[in-house]
């Protein structure tokens, strides 16, 4: 959580953002919130990004205001427009790409004052593991696959019942290229499984960690998957 | 050149299925937030469905559940399964690529007609 | 859901007049995501303005967008007997994620 306060002149107010990471390809949320103004057209709020010249995106008198805008965000940014009154001054940007990650700065301009906070948004891709068993094998086993991580991320398998066991010398793990020459397709497998144990292949990289469990019985197969973001500090 | 061109439309009865494709050229599908977009005849545009660079998918409410985007990256082509087809389905269907400066490539349509 | 309204459903007008077509949001749309498309009969819809006010690619500039919040305008200068279509303004961003007006058909008069 990063929190910064205003500068000289008027009084400061307090601007809070909170670093987060996008999956590329998708719509990702740049969080930034400060003190409230009643009047929304006192309001101005100001997206920077360092390195880029224009703005990132800039609202003031209850409305977009485009006209100084870097070419890179054209047609790509929004804030939320309703919830400016009530302090929420976050930035959501259209299909995240990895070049978008940075130090952001997020500054605010009320009847109040003035104040400001940075961000770091990392860019990444990541996404659920599905755990299956693998019918083709010859023995018992079990394949772990993710269609898009980036950057590379580690995998490790567990078991419910060998806790503290190092698979590493019974799993293989792949990756391979996605045609966008970017993004990673995650495939593990794990040798000489035994029945009535549960085991959970985990993904991570410096932006998420992901977790795909299977229950293996005589009788059912039970799955879970689970995603965690791992960067969230406010500032 | 940049290019989007449907096919696989055509005369299917209620409850039917079809699937319509997409081929795209001069640029990579995956890269781009791909869309349907259909027009009933002498009516306005509806969007219908989405799939994200990511490869998540999001849909219209009118179509849920009975239709499903998908892509096949190494055809560097975009698809739509219909299924349970009703008679409001009736449309040109046009596949449309989102290049973040809204909708700026468009295939040239294939018609789709569900009637008995 | 946001809904686009546009008006005039129908604009008569004669080449080399200016015409100014308005689109209307239901709730406040961001700028960013506001596109104005020209669709002629039998043919796709073809994109001219993007972020409320940027021209698409080989648009001339006879084409301009203005407006924010929920009141957004698209005039053509002086109009060519080419631009006589029907022209829909769209927003990206909400449920459903996209949304088009229901258009407004620009005829010789």
């Known amino acids: 959580l990063i929190i910064g306060f205003g500068i000289s002149g008027r009084h400061s107010i307090t601007v809070t953002t909170v670093a987060s990471a996008g999956n590329i390809g998708e719509d990702g949320i740049l969080s930034c919130t400060f003190e409230p103004d009643i009047k929304l057209s006192d309001i101005v709020i100001q997206w920077l990004k360092e390195g880029v010249l224009g703005l990132v995106h800039e609202f003031k008198e209850g409305k977009d205001e485009l006209s100084e805008q870097d070419e890179m965000f054209r047609g790509r940014t929004a804030v939320f427009a309703d919830q400016v009154i009530v302090g929420n001054a976050s930035l959501r940007l259209k299909n995240v790409q990895l070049t978008d990650a940075g130090t952001y700065k997020c500054y605010i301009i009320t009847s109040k004052g003035k104040g400001n906070a940075n961000l770091e948004y990392k860019t990444g891709a990541f996404s659920m593991p599905e755990v299956n068993v693998d019918y083709n094998a010859s023995s018992e086993t079990l394949r772990c696959e993710a269609p898009r991580w980036f950057p590379q991320p580690t995998v490790v398998w567990a078991s419910q019942v060998d806790q503290g066991a190092n698979f590493s010398e019974v799993s293989n793990t792949s990756f391979e290229l996605n045609s966008e020459n970017v993004t990673m397709k995650v495939v593990s497998v794990l040798y000489n499984v035994t029945i009535n144990n549960t085991y959970s292949c985990m993904i991570e990289n410096d932006i998420a960690k992901a977790t795909g469990d299977i229950k293996v019985t005589e009788s059912e197969i039970k799955r879970r998957s689970h995603l965690q973001l791992l960067n969230s500090k406010a500032s | 050149e940049v290019q989007l061109v449907e096919s696989g439309g055509g005369l299917i009865q209620p409850g039917g299925s079809l699937r319509l494709s997409c081929a795209a050229s001069g640029f990579i599908v995956s890269r781009n937030y791909m869309n349907w977009v259909r027009q009933a005849p002498g009516k306005g545009l509806e969007w219908v469905s989405v799939i994200y660079g990511s490869g998540r998918t999001d849909y219209a409410d009118s179509v849920k559940g009975r239709f499903t985007i998908s892509r096949d990256n190494s055809k560097n082509t975009l698809y739509l399964q219909m299924n349970s087809l009703r008679a409001e389905d009736t449309a040109v269907y046009y596949c449309a690529r989102d290049a973040d400066y809204g909708l700026d490539v468009w295939g040239q349509g294939t018609t789709v007609t569900v009637s008995s | 859901e946001i809904v686009l309204t546009q008006s005039p459903g129908t604009l008569s007008l004669s080449p080399g007049e200016r015409a100014t077509l308005s689109c209307r949001a239901s709730?406040?749309?961001?700028?960013?995501?506001l596109a104005w498309y020209q669709q002629k009969p039998g043919q796709a819809p073809r994109l001219l303005i993007y972020g409320a006010s940027s021209r698409a690619t080989g648009i001339p500039d006879r084409f301009s967008g203005s407006g924010s919040g929920t009141d957004f305008t698209l005039t053509i200068s002086r109009l060519e007997p080419e631009d006589f279509a029907v022209y829909y303004c769209?927003?990206?961003?909400?449920?459903?994620?996209?949304?088009f007006g229901q258009g407004t058909k620009l005829e010789i008069k």
């Open positions: 769209q927003q990206y961003g909400s449920s459903p994620l996209y949304t």
């Open positions: 709730q406040s749309v961001s700028s960013s995501y």
